[in-house]
């Protein structure tokens, strides 16, 4: 059981993907901190020449949904929805393979950006994955 909060997204960096949907946050005032972190991460990504168009098309919304996960409306307690494991793996191993290798070896990016670990996500056919966030 989580002990976080569900609250409307109130930032701008990810507004195109999230709108004003309800997102899960571990503490009431965490959104601002994460907004600043993701802005800093996007700045680093944007100023590096390591991001291909095919990768960014899916990586940017994926990072937004990872940083600001939708709340699981089916749950009786505040609970985040996971990214879908199959999409996470396609992103990591196919669309953004080069970019992931670069990011994982770059401490400046790792400092600002928490990359999703696909292995932590529920298996595609499991009940836990039924409500995952599809990009």
């Amino acid at each position: 059981e989580e002990d976080g909060f569900c609250q409307p997204y109130r930032g701008i960096a990810c507004a195109r993907f999230i709108g004003n949907r309800t997102v899960y946050m571990e503490s009431l005032h965490m959104q601002g901190e994460i907004e600043n972190q993701i802005t800093a991460a996007f700045t680093m990504i944007g100023t590096s020449s390591h991001l291909s168009d095919k990768c960014s098309q899916f990586a940017i919304p994926s990072l937004c949904h990872y940083a600001f996960p939708y709340c699981d409306e089916t749950s009786s307690v505040p609970k985040p929805r996971d990214l879908c494991r199959d999409e996470c793996e396609i992103l990591e191993n196919v669309l953004c393979q080069t970019e992931y290798i670069f990011a994982r070896s770059n401490p400046m990016i790792l400092m600002r950006l928490k990359l999703p670990n696909c292995e932590d996500l529920p298996q595609p056919e499991s009940p836990e994955a039924a409500n995952c966030i599809r990009i």
Epitope: A13, A15, L28, H29, G32, E35, N36, T39, T47
Partner: antibody, heavy 118, light 107 residues
């Protein structure tokens, strides 16, 4: 040197349209949120709209939602405010300003006056 | 939307005076508040961000503080160039909102 320069203001009739431009220089345009803030004659500041060019995400004040559209052209380092269905109460000096994260508007343009009158 | 109620709307003070302006948020905004100074015919200037952080180049006589949903801008010793209008603004949630402004005039 960071610079924001607004243009496009002028006199327009109620119901008319106008497009404001905000030309940015001296910083990485797509990394900052660009805002429009207005100030009616003798009144206080009112935030109007914002765009984060990197993700093309936008936000609007309720008073302009559905009438105004903010956009950005990263190749020209310019943000725009398309204002339609203008009303007398939209008369104001319009400023563009930039922000990084949630740290306040650190640079502002000089402002451009929009007058809506018949 | 979050309302920022600023007081007083105007005040008269003399050079050397200590001046305090307050802003109350209608709900919790954490420390996501900025303060600006504006002179007639000019764009506003950022003074304080994150409730109490002094923006680069701003004199140290300006300071900001927070107590719950109450925010204070203090000018420790008013200088001639400080006569202006001051605005608070919340950064916690879009739409961003400003206080009504406080005009600091010469007594």
């Amino acid at each position: 040197e960071v610079q924001l320069v607004e243009s496009g203001g002028g006199l327009v009739q109620p119901g008319g349209s106008l497009r404001l431009s905000c030309a940015a220089s001296g910083f990485t345009f797509s990394s900052y949120v660009i805002h429009w803030v207005r100030q009616a004659p003798g009144k206080g500041l009112e935030w109007v709209a914002a765009i984060y060019p990197y993700t093309s995400s936008t936000q609007y004040a309720d008073s302009v939602k559905g009438r105004f559209t903010i956009s950005a052209d990263t190749s020209k380092n310019t943000a725009y405010l398309q204002m339609n269905s203008l009303r007398a109460e939209d008369t104001a000096v319009y400023y563009c300003a930039r922000s990084y994260g949630t740290g306040g508007f650190d640079y502002w343009g000089q402002g451009t006056l929009v007058t809506v009158s018949s | 939307d979050i309302q920022m109620t600023q007081s007083p709307s105007s005040l008269s003070a003399s050079v050397g005076d200590r001046v305090t302006i307050t802003c109350r948020a209608s709900q919790s905004v954490s420390s996501a508040v900025a303060w600006y100074q504006q002179k007639p015919g000019k764009a506003p200037k950022l003074l304080i961000y994150s409730a109490s952080s002094l923006y680069s180049g701003v004199p140290s006589r300006f300071s900001g503080s927070r107590s719950g949903t109450d925010f204070t801008l203090t000018i420790s010793s008013l200088q001639p160039e400080d006569f202006a209008t001051y605005y608070c603004q919340q950064w916690y949630s879009y739409p961003l909102t400003f206080g009504q402004g406080t005009k600091v005039e010469i007594k």
